[in-house]
């Protein structure tokens, strides 16, 4: 037979049990509180650091792009995609039509100064978007050149040159000495590409990735 | 309401629910332990009569309305 | 981790905590009910001896290890 507990011992046991249970409760509540605090405070710190990052990102661009036009991407209030204010946006890129006349090298330099490159056209849809903003009586440099004059065309951003996604005018390219590509309008074929001498000043099209802040 | 705001509201509700339930659970746990001790005391001394303290505990267990 | 992702993770933690505690609470509540019924039966028929079922309940109440 088990020796009987004294009421005093039972009181003591109950007291210890209560202490243990309430300690557990306190620990649980503390853990919950930590969880909740993390959930509430971290996002604000996150938002703060995100804001700081955004501001420094904006400062980076401010030198050449004093103002940005931003649109909200998706549902999340935190994600904005921006293009410099005079630029136009299409899909994940921003485009700028430079009306200043420059040689191909200078046009590329001009784009790079703005954090962009001469335009690389990857799809028919992209070209169709770009031509909406072009003047028919002008020619515009593309980010496409053949530096060696051996018909090894290359895009400025190292995108592989795909013969199947090119929009040359018929009969073009036609001159090994013409090592830079332009887009221009021909009444017979509408808009298409042509090879020309790189040193002859033309207008140009710059393209940059959207700025995500 | 935006998606993130909704998430924080849900956080707050779940947090409060967690706290309330933790407190209720611990309270019940202690009551169960007390009930066990009371039970033991009752089986040990049926002829001695119930002390007020034990009666109280019994009453609590018997008539306590379950939390909704 | 992104801000909303963090919120959802914490939501999940709090949600799971709530579910687990709700289950534990309900389990304990049921045990308390059973204990109350057992208590009543015991006080009503002291000379009839404890049935196995009651003994089990008693044992459960007596020796149950408190959940951590």
């Amino acid at each position: 037979m088990v020796p009987e507990e004294e009421p005093q011992d039972r009181e003591k046991g109950l007291w210890w049990f209560q202490l243990k249970v309430w300690s557990m409760a306190v620990v649980s509540i503390l853990l919950l509180s930590v969880c909740f605090t993390v959930s509430s405070v971290v996002p604000h710190n996150f938002m703060y650091s995100k804001t700081v990052k955004r501001l420094s990102k904006l400062r980076e661009y401010q030198q050449y792009h004093p103002s940005l036009t931003c649109v909200m991407e998706g549902k999340d209030i935190e994600d904005w995609s921006c293009c410099p204010t005079p630029w136009t946006s299409f899909q994940s890129s921003c485009y700028f039509i430079s009306t200043g006349m420059q040689s191909w090298t200078k046009s590329q330099k001009n784009c790079s100064v703005m954090g962009a490159d001469l335009v690389v056209i990857n799809t028919r849809e992209e070209q169709d978007f770009i031509i909406q903003n072009l003047k028919r009586n002008s020619s515009y440099f593309l980010g496409l050149s053949d530096p060696g004059g051996r018909r090894h065309w290359q895009w400025v951003d190292q995108t592989p040159y795909n013969e199947n996604v090119t929009f040359w005018h018929s009969g073009e390219p036609n001159n090994l000495d013409e090592r830079c590509a332009i887009i221009n309008f021909r009444s017979s074929e509408e808009w298409g590409w042509n090879d020309i001498h790189c040193h002859v000043p033309q207008k140009s099209i710059c393209k940059m990735k959207k700025i995500y802040i | 309401l935006g998606e993130p705001q909704l998430c924080y509201i849900l956080d707050a509700i779940l947090f409060l629910y967690g706290i309330v339930l933790t407190l209720l659970y611990c309270r019940l746990k202690i009551q169960v332990r007390k009930a066990a001790i009371t039970s033991y005391e009752k089986s040990d001394g049926v002829y001695t009569g119930l002390s007020t303290r034990n009666q109280e505990t019994y009453e609590t267990l018997k008539h306590e309305k379950p939390p909704q | 981790l992104g801000e909303p992702q963090l919120c959802y993770i914490l939501d999940a933690i709090l949600f799971l905590y709530g579910i687990v505690l709700t289950l534990l609470y309900c389990r304990l509540k049921i045990q308390v009910r059973k204990a109350a019924i057992t208590s009543y039966e015991k006080s009503d028929g002291v000379y009839t001896g404890l049935s196995t079922r009651n003994q089990e309940t008693y044992e459960t109440l007596k020796h149950e290890k408190p959940p951590q």
Epitope: Q102, K106, K109, N110, V113, H199, P201 | - | -
Partner: antibody, heavy 120, light 107 residues
Framework: DVQLQESGPGLVKPSQSLSLTCSVT?????????WNWVRQFPGNQLECMGY???????NYNPSLKNRISITRDTSKNQFFLKLNSVTTEDTATYYC?????????????WGQGTLVTVSA | DIQMTQSPASLSASVGETVTITCRAS??????LAWYQQKQGKSPQLLVY???TLVDGVPSRFSGSGSGTEYSLKINSLQPEDFGIYFC?????????FGGGTKLEIR
């Protein structure tokens, strides 16, 4: 070696048109480069007036846009300047110049220049 | 249009001296600057392009420098044939404009 030679009347009356010819030897104007007209005023200030490219397109200085025209005759390897409604302010030495040398970094080939005086 | 401001408008120097002519652009011209020398009754002659590259045949006593908007042409140990008018011209964006010229005379 490429050589450029300007020719045209040395005296033009105000409100009339000034017409000059640049004859190019040693290089075909349809092969490459762009072909400019540059003038130098009596005070030595130089001004780029405009050009015609090897493929025949034009660009003009905005200050002259509605008065200037640059054309060419590819069979003669010549290009021309026509400046309408001249005033005494248009008195200058006119040069034809090849553009695009050194990756368009400087004008390396100039004609010897022709002085045009606008006077009644 | 980018404006080019050249200074001084004129300067006198002796043979053997070193002179510096400066040119300021109204905007960044990214080193696309040329220097010309013009003798009396002749057409301008290109000396320097891309701010610092000497044209073949130009004596090494000529040197170009600068960046952004500020550029200069330095002539070490002046020779009698160096006297004349010097012009700068930017080649960044059409229209390519010239500085007003610096008349270098023998003292």
């Amino acid at each position: 070696d490429v050589q450029l030679q300007e020719s045209g009347p040395g005296l033009v009356k105000p409100s009339q048109s000034l017409s000059l010819t640049c004859s190019v030897t040693g290089y075909s104007i349809t092969s490459a480069y762009y072909w400019n007209w540059v003038r130098q005023f009596p005070g030595n200030q130089l001004e780029c007036m405009g050009y015609i490219t090897y493929d025949g397109s034009n660009n003009y200085n905005p200050s002259l846009k509605n008065r200037i025209s640059i054309t060419r005759d590819t069979s003669k390897n010549q290009f021309f300047l026509k400046l309408n409604s001249v005033t005494t302010e248009d008195t200058a030495t006119y040069y034809c110049v090849r553009g695009g040398d050194y990756d368009d970094g400087g004008f390396a080939y100039w004609g010897q220049g022709t002085l045009v005086t606008v006077s009644a | 249009d980018i404006q080019m401001t050249q200074s001084p408008a004129s300067l006198s120097a002796s043979v053997g001296e070193t002179v510096t002519i400066t040119c300021r652009a109204s905007g960044n011209i990214h080193n696309y600057l040329a220097w010309y020398q013009q003798k009396q009754g002749k057409s301008p002659q290109l000396l320097v392009y891309n701010a610092k590259t000497l044209v073949d045949g130009v004596p090494s006593r000529f040197s170009g420098s600068g960046s952004g908007t500020e550029y200069s042409l330095k002539i070490n140990s002046l020779q009698p044939e160096d006297f004349g008018i010097y012009f700068c011209q930017h080649f960044w964006i059409i229209p390519y404009t010239f500085g007003g010229g610096t008349k270098l005379e023998i003292r």
